[in-house]
């Protein structure tokens, strides 16, 4: 009794593919040095029709050799998952019936090298090149299997992708589209205006494709992507015009269009009546000479920061600007100030601004309940990390400009709405984290006694915002509690 | 009794694919130096119709060879997960039924090398190129299998919620849809408008989950 789909029908995707993709993602950098070796392994073992099981069986076995590489535990864990998961799942899917699998010890050296070098001399990189290719092939082969075994309602009709949308922050760039596939799969291609098409995310059932490693090659180029739709289980079959259906994306110029990520205040230092505030220079995925460039490296003087600052005791804000990552501002002696920064690219006409950084304040003494609030913030960060890989499109009531006299009311709304995230994620660790956070927050709130606030907005009167903005505003209000605890 | 989905129904995506994707992500840079090697493994082992299991079985086994490379522990852990997970999951899916699995010690050398050189001589880069390709092939092959394992089950029309409407874009299994409060009503804070098309394992019948939504004036 082998229910591949299991309880909610996503076993393969949620385990094996996640590991494969994480491995491949961690190997993004590998490739440019691989000298396009033709590995014989892939000549002899091909994920061909009726041979997918055998290919995957061999590839999974091959993967095990890499487990003894001196790599990080995380990487090994994924390799183990892909290798073992493939082997297990193969038994379940029956794709290798009647085949005699290959013996396990055999390796896959390259043709040219095998003629004249001992393996010990071979660069580590070459192993990684092979490993990356092996992972890619395993992924492709699984995709091929999993597309092919779905029962169809007697039709190979495909639907063209639509609503192709670029989602890009600090050059991390993902193409998203609709619809969720039913009996079809997608492959994405990307090119510059003058370049060749490069295929990515082969035969995927996802409705997004990470194109970061393509666009970071030249962020000032304009890119176009297209999404091909294929019938599940019959990727060779084409549309009526003799080629698969596809839809083009809007053009995308990363330098002009990537969203600016939320900045972070790295430090502030007071000397007399001057305070020096430093903004963290965030690393991007853009590379030059084998190093990742920072946001400032990429944008230079095109990027400016706006600082908002105010006395902890009042709400009247002041502002300053810099085209470096440092501000030097005048403050009143003996006063504590709070700071928030925003990144801006003045030369742009859209996507000019980032969201505001979390608020940082001077002289935050550890009050009795400050520790609780600090833990609430770390729980919120944890929730933010956990939901990143999920597609929760909920909008939540969010108070983004909390007046100090309404902070308890606002906090209660945040705590209520947090439960929606818990409900919709269906994830045990999110559920536990939310539960823990609510307990911590309620403990701290009860320490204020029964505060009655009047003239404050009901939760339902607040603006609904996406989860990211909701969590950012939540962090802001917690900072407010920290500053006054 | 092989419940691939595991306890929380996301076993494959959250374990195997996560590892595959993490490995591939860490190998992003690998490729441009790979000189478009045509690895024989992928010529001999193809994730073809009705052969997906064997391909994955071999690919998982092949992955194990990389565990001995001098890479980071993190990388190895993912490799181990992909290799072992594939093996385990293959047993579960029945994709290798009736096949004689390979003996554990056998590796997959390329044609020319196996004739005259030991594996030790092979450049590490080349191995990585191969590994990356192997992971990609395993991932694709799994996708191919797993897309085919569930017949197209759909949900009936969703239940009605007081003062709310729903426009269903897809009745397919695992579709997530939202109710919208009628004009003049707002979602009560703390309630969710989400409903999901899920499968009742006992009856094998799909149904929409009950939303916690309350619409208030």
């Amino acid at each position: 009794d082998c229910d591949i789909e299991g309880k909610d029908g996503k076993q393969y995707e949620s385990v094996l593919m996640v590991s494969i993709d994480q491995l491949l993602d961690s190997m993004k950098e590998i490739g440019s040095n691989c000298l396009n070796n033709e590995f014989n392994f892939f000549k002899r073992h091909i994920c061909d029709a009726n041979k997918e099981g055998m290919f995957l069986f061999r590839a999974a076995r091959k993967l095990r050799q890499f487990l003894k590489m001196n790599s990080t535990g995380d990487f090994d864990l994924h390799l183990l998952k892909v290798s073992e998961g493939t082997t297990i799942l193969l038994n379940c899917t029956g794709q290798v019936k009647g085949r005699k699998p290959a013996a396990l010890g055999e390796a896959q050296p390259t043709k040219s090298l095998e003629e004249n070098k001992s393996l010990k001399e071979q660069k580590k990189l070459n192993d990684l090149c092979f490993l990356k290719r092996l992972l890619q092939e395993i992924k492709t082969c699984w995709n091929k299997i999993l597309m092919g075994t779905k029962e169809h309602s007697g039709t190979t009709n495909t639907v063209a992708a639509y609503n192709l949308t670029w989602k890009s922050t600090n050059f991390k760039t993902i193409l998203e589209w609709e619809p969720k596939p039913v009996n079809q799969v997608y492959t994405v291609q990307i090119s510059t205006k003058s370049g060749d098409w490069k295929s990515k995310c082969f035969y995927t059932t996802d409705t997004e494709c990470d194109l970061t490693d393509e666009i970071v090659k030249d962020v000032k180029q304009t890119y176009l992507a297209r999404v091909f739709s294929y019938p599940a289980g019959n990727v060779e079959s084409t549309g009526s015009a003799g080629e698969p259906l596809y839809e083009n994306s809007p053009e995308f110029t990363p330098y002009l269009e990537t969203n600016l990520g939320q900045p972070t205040i790295q430090s502030f230092e007071q000397v007399g009546t001057k305070v020096n505030v430093t903004v963290e220079d965030e690393r991007t995925l853009v590379r030059r000479n084998n190093t990742f460039l920072s946001l400032r490296d990429v944008f230079g003087k095109d990027l400016i920061y706006t600082l908002y600052y105010w006395k902890s005791s009042s709400s009247g804000k002041k502002t300053a600007k810099t085209n470096t990552n440092e501000f030097l501002i005048d403050v009143d002696k003996g006063e504590n100030y709070c700071f928030s920064v925003q990144a801006v690219i003045p030369s742009r006409t859209v996507n000019r601004k980032s969201t505001d950084s979390p608020v940082e304040c001077m002289g935050q003494e550890k009050g009795e309940f400050r520790e609780n609030w600090v833990n609430v913030i770390s729980d919120l960060k944890k929730i933010e990390d956990l939901i990143q890989s999920m597609h929760i499109d909920a909008t939540l009531y969010t108070e983004s400009d909390v007046h100090p006299s309404c902070k308890v009311t606002a906090m209660k709304c945040f705590l209520l709405e947090l439960q929606v995230i818990s409900l919709e994620s269906g994830d045990a660790s999110i559920h536990d984290t939310v539960e823990n956070l609510i307990i911590l927050a309620n403990n701290s709130l009860s320490s204020n006694g029964n505060v009655t606030e009047s003239g404050c907005k009901e939760c339902e009167e607040l603006e609904e915002k996406n989860i990211k903005e909701f969590l950012q505003s939540f962090v802001h209000i917690v900072q407010m509690f920290i500053n006054t605890s | 009794d092989c419940d691939i989905e595991g306890k929380d129904g996301k076993q494959y995506e959250s374990v195997l694919m996560v590892s595959i994707d993490q490995l591939l992500d860490s190998m992003k840079e690998i490729g441009s130096n790979c000189l478009n090697n045509e690895f024989n493994f992928f010529k001999r082992h193809i994730c073809d119709a009705n052969k997906e299991g064997m391909f994955l079985f071999r690919a998982a086994r092949k992955l194990r060879q990389f565990l001995k490379m001098n890479s980071t522990g993190d990388f190895d852990l993912h490799l181990l997960k992909v290799s072992e997970g594939t093996t385990i999951l293959l047993n579960c899916t029945g994709q290798v039924k009736g096949r004689k699995p390979a003996a554990l010690g056998e590796a997959q050398p390329t044609k020319s090398l196996e004739e005259n050189k030991s594996l030790k001589e092979q450049k590490k880069l080349n191995d990585l190129c191969f590994l990356k390709r192997l992971l990609q092939e395993i991932k694709t092959c799994w996708n191919k299998i797993l897309m085919g394992t569930k017949e197209h089950i759909t949900c009936p029309p969703p239940m009605s919620v007081e003062h709310a409407d729903i426009w269903v874009k897809s009745y397919s299994l695992y579709s997530r849809e939202r109710y919208i409060c009628n004009s003049g009503f707002k979602r009560k804070a703390g309630t969710s408008s989400l409903t999901e098309c899920v499968l009742n394992k006992a009856t094998n019948v799909a149904h929409w989950t009950t939303p916690s939504l309350k619409c208030i004036r």
Partner: antibody
Framework: QIQLVQSGGEVKKPGASVRVSCKAS????????VYWVRQSPGKGLEWIGY????????IYDQNFKGKATLTVDKSTSTAYMELSSLRSEDTAVYFC??????????WGQGTTVTVSS | DIQMTQSPASLSASVGDRVTITCLAS??????LAWYLQKPGKSPQLLIY???NLADGVPSRFSGSGSGTDFSFTISSLQPEDFATYYC?????????FGQGTKLEIK
């Protein structure tokens, strides 16, 4: 093309309030701050404050705190300035302008507010 | 607050003349300075931003220079339409103060 169109002139009695609007078109409203500037008869330009439609943050000159309140309506791409407790010295032309971070590149045509008993 | 001192307050010149107006900041503002022109009954119009950059559509006879605390604005050859009031503004830190203006009149 980019335009900032302000509401018409107003005559008010001392102690009253007035709301001046500034409707923006031809650009992404939330991407640019809206500045407000006063020019009293025969005088120079005085900066009142600005609002960032993206996050709702307002910054005021100390002299206008409590006098001016800046708001926006993102759905109509309109910025508003409310002046309260009007006095004769508030008689002036009030301008809104679009801030490109390094300067004010587009200005409204100005709204004359006259405070007279 | 940063004070902006503009000089001269008024200036008479003829068509074809070269004229320079200066603006002094009470503390360093790097190059966060803009220059505007205003004609009677009209809205101000941006001429120079970031101390030295010519705004779109502004004739090249206008130029700006300086950084830190000392700035100047020059019209290389006065045209009849250039007779107006000119303002500098610092956009470095709030309040974003203007200079008191320089009225340029026909001699």
């Amino acid at each position: 093309q980019i335009q900032l169109v302000q509401s018409g002139g107003e005559v008010k009695k001392p102690g009253a309030s007035v709301r001046v609007s500034c409707k923006a078109s031809g650009y992404s409203f939330t991407d640019y701050n809206v500045y407000w500037v006063r020019q009293s008869p025969g005088k120079g330009l005085e900066w009142i404050g600005y609002i960032d439609p993206y996050n709702g943050i307002t910054i005021y000159d100390q002299n206008f705190k409590g006098k001016a309140t800046l708001t926006v309506d993102k759905s109509t791409s309109t910025a508003y300035m409310e002046l309260s407790s009007l006095r004769s010295e508030d008689t002036a032309v009030y301008f809104c302008a679009r801030d490109v971070t390094t300067a004010l590149d587009f200005w409204g045509q100005g709204t004359t507010v006259t405070v007279s008993s | 607050d940063i004070q902006m001192t503009q000089s001269p307050a008024s200036l008479s010149a003829s068509v074809g003349d070269r004229v320079t107006i200066t603006c002094l900041a009470s503390q360093t503002i790097d190059t966060w300075l803009a220059w505007y022109l205003q004609k009677p009954g009209k809205s101000p119009q941006l001429l120079i931003y970031a101390a030295t950059n010519l705004a779109d559509g502004v004739p090249s006879r206008f130029s700006g220079s300086g950084s830190g605390t000392d700035f100047s604005f020059t019209i290389s050859s006065l045209q009849p339409e250039d007779f107006a009031t000119y303002y500098c503004q610092q956009v470095y830190s709030s309040p974003f103060t203007f200079g008191q203006g320089t009225k340029l009149e026909i001699k």
